[in-house]
């Protein structure tokens, strides 16, 4: 049976998490690298692509499924594969740490990719200013 | 219609074990992250541990960490919650639960529970 | 780790408004659940992400979350929602429930 509760990741819940995964973190994933990509043909897309190809790595399980969520709700999730850098690996951490820097910046200046967006927009100079606190 | 019956449930002397069961029905079992909560008479509601939706990550609550372990069989839609070294204060209900995203957020069916009883 | 903080009890009159808190450091940047549990029973979800109701909850059920303060606020409270609260966010890659209210319907 269908469930009464149809939850989707919002910003505020990725910010979050990379904001966990990132803080005090010189590596992730023993180091793995990855196809750099650009986050402005579609981020959620986008980073998931690179970061799917990550196997073996806790650390990122959660990222990887709330993008997986956020990119399924996105009419032109398929449009992606052509904006990837074929020639330009990065480390796992500097790809989450380019995601993360990106989604402050669209939910700063509301270029907002889906509903729950929106109504997290008027929170972002919180964020700004108090990811440091967050808890691990 | 989605069900979750938990089983297993017993009195036990500290330091014994026991194995939890959960039977989940009236939905696809494998497409879901689960988790166990358990609560102490009169007490609130404590996360114990929880499990990805194909087994590939658990993650437990300190107070249970080193001697529970949460596992689940797909193809038989059960959750399981093996408990060694108990413990007096493990004394509770344990509640089997179901988490609607596949990311790990929150639960939106609960079974009825079972009664563990942790006494000398 | 996370510590969740409600009131142990709420009392309001029958048909009045009754606002349940739930504090932590930052829960703004969290997504707040809720969850009613009457004697003998199991939990039941009644907010989910701040301010979602599922599908069954009745609409005098609403919650918000700003500043420092998630709230569950149940306008015309009837005797049926004796019962009690429990707010929930995900943190230290688990679930952390708070301590829990207590809500009596007077009257």
């Known amino acids: 049976s269908p469930s009464p509760v149809t939850p989707s990741p919002t910003l505020k819940e990725l910010i979050e998490e990379l904001v966990n995964i990132t803080q005090n973190q010189a590596s992730l994933c023993n180091g793995s690298m990855v196809w750099s990509v650009n986050l402005t043909a579609g981020m959620y897309c986008a980073a998931l692509e690179s970061l799917i190809n990550v196997s073996d790595c806790s650390a990122i399980q959660r990222t990887q499924r709330m993008l997986k969520a956020l990119c399924s709700q996105k009419p032109a999730a398929g449009q992606i594969s052509s904006e990837r850098s074929r020639d330009t690996k990065i480390e796992v951490i500097q790809l989450v740490k380019n995601l993360l820097t990106y989604v402050r910046g669209v939910y700063r200046h509301g270029n907002f990719r889906g509903l729950n967006d929106i109504f997290e927009a008027q929170k972002i100079e919180w964020h700004e200013h108090h990811h440091h606190h967050h808890h691990h | 219609e989605v069900q979750l019956v938990e089983s297993g449930g017993d009195s036990v002397r500290p330091g014994g074990s026991l194995r939890l069961s959960c039977v989940a029905s009236?939905?696809?079992?494998?497409?879901?992250?689960m988790g166990w909560v358990r609560q102490a008479p009169g007490k609130g509601l404590q996360w114990v541990a929880w499990?990805?939706?194909?087994?590939?990550?658990?993650s437990y609550a300190d107070a249970v960490k080193g001697r529970f372990t949460i596992s689940r069989d797909n193809a038989k839609d059960t959750l399981y919650l093996q408990m060694d070294d108990l413990r007096v204060d493990d004394t509770a209900v344990y509640y089997c639960?179901?988490?609607?995203?596949?990311?790990?957020?929150?639960?939106?069916?609960w079974g009825q529970g079972t009664l563990v009883t942790v006494s000398s | 780790s996370y510590v969740l903080t409600q009131p142990p009890s709420v009392t309001v009159p029958l048909r009045q408004t009754a606002r349940i808190s739930c504090g932590g450091d930052?829960?703004?940047?969290?997504?707040v659940h809720w969850y009613q549990q009457k004697p003998g029973q199991a939990p039941v979800l009644i907010i989910y992400?701040?301010?979602n109701r599922p599908t069954g909850i009745p609409e005098r059920f609403s919650g918000s979350n700003s500043g420092n303060m998630a709230t569950l606020t149940i306008r015309g409270a009837l005797a049926e929602d004796e019962a009690d609260y429990y707010c929930?966010?995900?943190?230290?890659?688990?679930?952390?429930f708070g301590s829990g209210t207590q809500l009596t319907v007077l009257g």
């Open positions: 639960a179901r988490d609607p995203s596949s990311w790990g957020s929150l639960f939106d069916y």
């Open positions: 009236g939905f696809t079992f494998s497409r879901y992250n």
């Open positions: 499990i990805y939706d194909g087994g590939s990550r658990t």
């Open positions: 930052n829960i703004r940047s969290k997504n």
């Open positions: 992400q701040d301010s």
């Open positions: 929930q966010v995900w943190a230290n890659d688990g679930y952390v």
